[in-house]
Structures are given as structure tokens and as C-alpha cells.
């Protein structure tokens, strides 16, 4: 029979014949022959391979270095890499999450639109008219100005994006 030019799924072509790939968690030791099956070996501890493969070396698990603000989100196995995330109050600097930076705070006049997560930074927005923020915070939203009317008071000092309005008593009309 003619040698194959393509192989089935989970196989690879070598020396004009189709050999079985090694399953996730195992590496290739020797290709199959006419008389023998592909020889695979399990990855060592703290190593992995996450696909059907013909790799001769397993990949090392990622190290979630606490000195870089990292912690383990998902422990590595023979078939999966370790997944790192950041300690509370920090977020990853890249998709690979190789290091962390402190969450950004929103300055006075700005409020938090979206609170940071382990993988994304704080998103700030300017406080619109009628709202203010007088603190630098990674959690505080813009607060609405106090409604003097509902307290039977009048505005004595207008609010800004950084300060609340100041309410005061209504001037009594003299008889």
C-alpha cells in the first residue's frame, strides 16, 4: 500500500507512517515504527503538556512569585499550566499576568466607573454636573449633591465636581 500523506486526528506523519500523538500530560520518548507503538512518558512534577503532542520536553509550570504581587489562582497539573492572579488591591500588567501593579485611584472630581479586578485596572469617570467626589479612591463612585430642598433648606454654596453643595436655613420674610 502507498504511504499515507495525511493522518487521522491525534496522529502525526513520520517516516511515511502515521504514529499516535502523546496524550496531554505526556511527552514523546520515541516515534512508532512498523512494529512498535509511539512511546510516551508522563511529565514530571511541576511540568505539563496541555495538548495531544509530539513534544520531547514538557513545559515548566509558571511560578506565581509572591514578591511580584502574584498568587496562584489555579494550581498546575500534568495537563494544565498554573494560572496566576494578583493579590488583593493589585492587578496584572499583561494577559500572561507575569507581574502586578497597584490599582489606580480616582482623583477628587472623578469617581469609579468600574472597580478593578485581578486582571483589570480601575476605570474612572469625571463627575458630571450634580455629582461630586472629594476623595482619591479606588472604590468610591461620584456622589450626588445634597438636595437642600428636601431638607427645607436653601443652597448657600454651589457644589462642584469636587465638593458638595452647602445648605443653609431659608431667610425668614420679616413682617
Amino acid at each position: 500500500p502507498e504511504p499515507p500523506t495525511a493522518c487521522r486526528e491525534k496522529q502525526y506523519l513520520i517516516n511515511s507512517q502515521c504514529c499516535s500523538l502523546c496524550q496531554p500530560g505526556q511527552k514523546l520518548v520515541s516515534d512508532c515504527t512498523e512494529f512498535t507503538e509511539t512511546e510516551c512518558l508522563p511529565c514530571g512534577e511541576s511540568e505539563f503538556l496541555d495538548t495531544w503532542n509530539r513534544e520531547t520536553h514538557c513545559h515548566q509550570h509558571k511560578y506565581c512569585d509572591p514578591n511580584l504581587g502574584l498568587r496562584v489562582q489555579q494550581k498546575g497539573t500534568s495537563e494544565t499550566d498554573t494560572i496566576c492572579t494578583c493579590e488583593e488591591g493589585w492587578h496584572c500588567t499583561s494577559e500572561a499576568c507575569e507581574s502586578c501593579v497597584l490599582h489606580r485611584s480616582c482623583s477628587p472630581g472623578f469617581g469609579v466607573k468600574q472597580i478593578a479586578t485581578g486582571v483589570s485596572d480601575t476605570i474612572c469617570e469625571p463627575c458630571p454636573v450634580g455629582f461630586f467626589s472629594n476623595v482619591s479612591s479606588a472604590f468610591e463612585k461620584c456622589h450626588p449633591w445634597t438636595s437642600c430642598e428636601t431638607k427645607d433648606l436653601v443652597v448657600q454654596q454651589a457644589g462642584t465636581n469636587k465638593t458638595d453643595v452647602v445648605c443653609g436655613p431659608q431667610d425668614r420674610l420679616r413682617a
Partner: antibody, heavy 119, light 113 residues
Framework: EVQLVESGGGLVKPGGSRRLSCAAS????????MHWVRQAPGKGLEWVAY????????YYADTVKGRFTISRDNAKNSLYLQMNSLRAEDTAVYYC????????????WGQGTLVTVSS | DIVMTQSPDSLAVSLGEKVTINCKSS????????????LTWHQQKPGQPPKLLIY???TRESGVPDRFSGSGSGTDFTLTISSLQAEDVAVYYC?????????FGGGTKVEIK
């Protein structure tokens, strides 16, 4: 036969130091990750620290971070736990346990060594 | 940290009776890459170190009798002893093997009635 034998336990004063050892035999020590787990008298199990087979990866419980150091010597088939600034709450039986690269679970445990921190 | 909550704390069962121990984790123990739940059960007999009983939620360690079985997924897990034997008197611990820090349940003490 897999064997893990801990030693180095004893009575220590608060603020003092102690070094525990775990001698491994019956398997290729350098192929396995290792853990220290402790158990306070009459209480449950608490994980303390982990070191990977090749020394590259080390993790600690927050309760011991900065005070305890896990290390290993693959040539001597030995695991160590250096414990500094000991506190009364560190009083426990300390077990070493093996982690393989297949189950990723602690599949063998030593008999444990008791560390008592008291003045 | 993942909190592991076991129930009951203890139970006394007659020989030959069924034992059910529950374990709840504060977050999922499902590894997204290989779809295995990294929940481990250990058995600790009086005066002895713990011994691995079940890993990946339901896979019995070699040499463990088939009266022991594990089930569950995500955050809810169960250890069952189908017919209690005298040698099963022990404390049973579930353990998060999904992430660091590794965490254990408080333990369930199984005694004979």
C-alpha cells in the same frame, strides 16, 4: 516501600528557632514535590508550605510567611523546614508529605514530629 | 482563600451501615483546562498520619477498598462508605487541591454505634 521520616521536633521557647528534617526513601526523591502540613493537638490539618521537585517553585501559608523557610537537598533525599520567631500557635505535629506529578495530591505522609512552643 | 466546610463534625454508625460525609468549598474546584475537580479525601486513624483515600473527587487511591466512593462537582462533594467496617473508624478530611493555599475541611469523626 515509600518512607518519610520527620525529625527535629521538641520544646522551643516563644521567639526561638527550630529546623525540622524529613528523610525520604523508597522512591526517587528528586521527582516529587514536597509539602509540610501541621496539626495542632486535637485539631485539624493545616497546610504550611510546598516546594517543587526541582526547587524552582515555593509557596507558603500566610500564617508562616516570612518566618518559615522550606528547602530540600535532592542529593541527600531530604526536606527541611526552618522555623524562626516561633509562637505558641505554631505548636503542632509537623508532617512532611509527597506530591507526585500525576495526581497532584499528597499521596504519602510521614509519621510527624511534635514541636511545642512554650516558655 | 478557599474555605472547606465539612458536615457532620462526627457521627456514630452501626457496622455494615452506610456513612455519608459532606464537604462544601467556598469556590469551585473545577480545573478549567482538564475538567477535573481537584477535591481530595484523606483518612486519619487514631494515632496515625493521614492517608490519601480519594483524589480528583472520585478516583480511589490504589489499595483503597471499593466501599469508599467519592462524588460531586464544583463546590459540593460527598464521601460515602457503603458498609462501615471496624477498621474505618477515623477522622476524614476533605481538601482543596485546586489552588494555594491548600485548605482542609475541619474533619468528620466516624465512630461505631
Amino acid at each position: 516501600e515509600v518512607q518519610l521520616v520527620e525529625s527535629g521536633g521538641g520544646l522551643v521557647k516563644p521567639g526561638g528557632s527550630r529546623r525540622l528534617s524529613c528523610a525520604a526513601s523508597g522512591f526517587t526523591f528528586s521527582d516529587y514535590g514536597m509539602h509540610w502540613v501541621r496539626q495542632a493537638p486535637g485539631k485539624g490539618l493545616e497546610w504550611v508550605a510546598y516546594i517543587s521537585s526541582g526547587n524552582r517553585i515555593i509557596y507558603y501559608a500566610d500564617t508562616v510567611k516570612g518566618r518559615f523557610t522550606i528547602s530540600r537537598d535532592n542529593a541527600k533525599n531530604s526536606l527541611y523546614l526552618q522555623m524562626n520567631s516561633l509562637r505558641a500557635e505554631d505548636t503542632a505535629v509537623y508532617y512532611c508529605a509527597r506530591q507526585d506529578g500525576y495526581r497532584y495530591a499528597m499521596d504519602y505522609w510521614g509519621q510527624g514530629t511534635l514541636v511545642t512552643v512554650s516558655s | 482563600d478557599i474555605v472547606m466546610t465539612q458536615s457532620p463534625d462526627s457521627l456514630a454508625v452501626s457496622l455494615g451501615e452506610k456513612v455519608t460525609i459532606n464537604c462544601k468549598s467556598s469556590q469551585s474546584l473545577l480545573n478549567s483546562g482538564n475538567q477535573k475537580n481537584y477535591l481530595t479525601w484523606h483518612q486519619q486513624k487514631p494515632g496515625q498520619p493521614p492517608k490519601l483515600l480519594i483524589y480528583w473527587t472520585s478516583t480511589r487511591e490504589s489499595g483503597v477498598p471499593d466501599r469508599f466512593s467519592g462524588s460531586g462537582s464544583g463546590t459540593d462533594f460527598t464521601l460515602t462508605i457503603s458498609s462501615l467496617q471496624a477498621e474505618d473508624v477515623a477522622v476524614y478530611y476533605c481538601q482543596n487541591d485546586y489552588t494555594y493555599p491548600l485548605t482542609f475541611g475541619g474533619g468528620t469523626k466516624v465512630e461505631i454505634k
